[in-house]
């Protein structure tokens, strides 16, 4: 569907041209669709003298005034002016209403049935205004930060929202710092989260017609300084043919800024280790974690001399970690031969 066709699917109130001055009462959270002229030649909408942009939560677009979810600040005077002139096609005042009721659920929302010039809407059970945003269930947040839960909904009468934690009514009275609620934004905010804030948070949205609920699973990550953590199994033992390219991967996790080196173990005077007990190594690559592709070691056009042990060494202000892997290089003429390589080593 094109956007224009999609909008056509929405009920759109089209105030009559005979009644230029109108007053509409709209419930908080209610979506608004108002027409002005035909879609292809629709007028321009203005709020309090300022023209509405074609994008955003409140927008004037193809002759339509669209408000995704009516908020108190949306109340006011709206004008629709004909394109290319200053002729007023619509002169509307939107008023915030607590709730809207209708005596007839089956009435066409496009028809004008209220002699007082106020529009009412059919009753409707609560629904999520953006259901596509309510799919990710589990959220991990570092301790000390702030979490905002939101469950924007609409319905008629305007639904109410309440919150549960682990199935129990949640008012935050036992939480240091408490909680902050914004019913008009369908939100709950918890500042400076701590591990005891972990749990399942449920928003329960209900009105006289029905109810809906959504669960957020919150995990709070405690951070304690530690030496870098290297992903198990990386770098991996690799077998390659002479002349081919090889990539060795090392995945590093670190709270403090890490420094990474790629080392190749070498033999000097027939020995792999020095008098101090440390292995002889050649530094192939060194950088901090912000450098592009530092966690990958590229070996181009490998030869037999490239075979051997490679180590990814990561350090930060707390300590060092390293893991090693073996590269086996096969001659071109015998690509099916494989050798048993020692297992990758991990030292923390």
């Amino acid at each position: 569907l094109e956007a224009s066709e999609e909008v056509e699917l929405e009920p759109c109130l089209a105030p009559s041209l005979e009644q230029q001055e109108q007053e509409l009462t709209v419930a908080l959270g209610q979506p608004v669709r108002l027409c002005c002229g035909r879609a292809e030649r629709g007028g321009h909408w203005y709020k309090e003298g300022s023209r509405l942009a074609p994008a955003g939560r409140v927008r004037g677009w193809r002759g339509r005034l669209e408000i995704a979810s009516f908020l108190p600040e949306d109340a006011g005077r709206y004008l629709c002016l004909a394109r290319g002139s200053m002729i007023v096609l619509q002169n509307l005042t939107l008023i915030t209403g607590d709730s809207l009721t209708s005596s007839n659920d089956d009435e066409d929302p496009k028809s004008h049935r209220d002699p007082s010039n106020r529009h009412s809407y059919p009753q409707q059970a609560p629904y999520w205004t953006h259901p596509q945003r309510m799919e990710k269930k589990l959220h991990a947040v570092p301790a000390g930060n702030t979490v905002k839960f939101r469950c924007p909904a609409a319905g008629n009468p305007t639904p109410t929202i309440r919150w549960l934690k682990d199935g129990q009514a949640f008012h935050g009275e036992n939480r240091i710092g408490g909680i902050r609620l914004r019913h008009q934004h369908w939100s709950l905010v918890m500042e400076s989260v701590v591990p005891s804030d972990r749990g399942t948070y449920t928003c329960l949205v209900e009105n006289a017609v029905g109810s809906i609920r959504y669960n957020y699973l919150l995990d709070v990550l405690e951070r304690s300084p530690h030496r870098p953590i290297l992903q198990a199994g990386l770098p991996a033992n690799t077998t390659a043919v002479v002349g081919s390219d090889v990539e060795l991967l090392c995945k590093v996790y670190s709270d403090a800024q890490p420094h990474i080196q790629w080392l190749k173990h070498i033999v000097i005077n027939g020995s792999s280790f020095g008098a101090d007990g440390f292995p002889y190594v050649q530094v192939l690559k060194t950088a901090d974690i912000n450098s592009s592709e530092v966690e990958v070691l590229y070996l181009r056009n490998v030869s037999a001399e490239d075979a051997g042990e490679y180590t990814c060494l990561a350090g930060n202000s707390i300590g060092l970690s390293y893991q090693s892997a073996w590269l086996t290089v096969l001659p071109e003429e015998d690509p099916t031969w494989t050798a048993a390589a020692p297992e990758a080593r991990y030292t923390d």
């Epitope: 930060n145 905002k148 939101r150």
Partner: antibody, heavy 127, light 107 residues
Framework: EVQLVESGGGLVQPGGSLRLSCAAS????????ISWVRQAPGKGLEWVGR????????NYADSVKGRFTISADTSKNTAYLQMNSLRAEDTAVYYC????????????????????WGQGTLVTVSS | DIQMTQSPSSLSASVGDRVTITCRAS??????LAWYKQKPGKAPKLLIY???FLYSGVPSRFSGSGSGTDFTLTISSLQPEDFATYYC?????????FGQGTKVEIK
């Protein structure tokens, strides 16, 4: 009490380098972040960049990308702003600010808020 | 970049006045907007986050509202210590951007 103290400002020639420090105390250093914001004389605030002290990730304004580097030493509770290839337009008071995330789980993004600021340090780039 | 435009750029008011400052974003920033107060020669101070949440320790005469592109900071009854420059700042887009500031002066 949360405190941030900047140091390292001064006069430097165009093309030169300077490293600013931001010593922090009174909060768990690795759980939040540090932002750098600057203010040219008589002008408004301009965000320079931010580091998340937990994972070391950094973000920069386009105007300083490739020239400025933000880093941190968690053992010293200190963040740094390394400024290279300085230009006259980099002249400003530089503030560091503790930055925490508001994790909006509905839209799955993080709003970054700067709640504690240092006193600022003046950097003058002039020949 | 998302442009933040504050209005007015300056205003004169008296103690006890109700003051309203507006901030408009060049594109939708949802509720990802903060307000800061700065006195001459001092660092900024956080007043409001997420468009309408009062930061702890900030007097209740300050309030924020709005979402999408249009936001408002209101001081219900101006006090002597409120004469300062106020900045809005969005952080939903990269980079974070500030408004140009609104200077509140004594009438």
């Amino acid at each position: 009490e949360v405190q941030l103290v900047e140091s390292g400002g001064g006069l430097v020639q165009p093309g030169g380098s300077l490293r600013l420090s931001c010593a922090a105390s009174g909060f768990t250093f690795t759980s939040t972040g540090i932002s750098w914001v600057r203010q040219a004389p008589g002008k408004g605030l301009e965000w320079v960049g931010r580091t998340h002290l937990g994972d070391g990730s950094t973000n920069y304004a386009d105007s300083v990308k490739g020239r400025f580097t933000i880093s941190a030493d968690t053992s010293k509770n200190t963040a740094y702003l390394q400024m290279n290839s300085l230009r006259a337009e980099d002249t400003a008071v530089y503030y560091c600010a503790r930055t925490y995330g508001i994790y909006d789980l509905y839209v799955d993004y993080t709003e970054y808020v700067m709640d504690y600021w240092g006193q600022g340090t003046l950097v003058t780039v002039s020949s | 970049d998302i442009q933040m435009t504050q209005s007015p750029s300056s205003l004169s008011a008296s103690v006890g006045d109700r003051v309203t400052i507006t901030c408009r974003a060049s594109q939708d920033v949802d509720t990802s907007l903060a307000w800061y107060k700065q006195k001459p020669g001092k660092a900024p101070k956080l007043l409001i986050y997420s468009a309408s949440f009062l930061y702890s320790g900030v007097p209740s005469r300050f309030s924020g509202s709005g979402s999408g592109t249009d936001f408002t900071l209101t001081i219900s009854s101006l006090q002597p210590e409120d004469f300062a420059t106020y900045y809005c700042q969005q952080s939903t887009g990269h980079p974070q951007t500030f408004g140009q500031g609104t200077k509140v002066e004594i009438k």
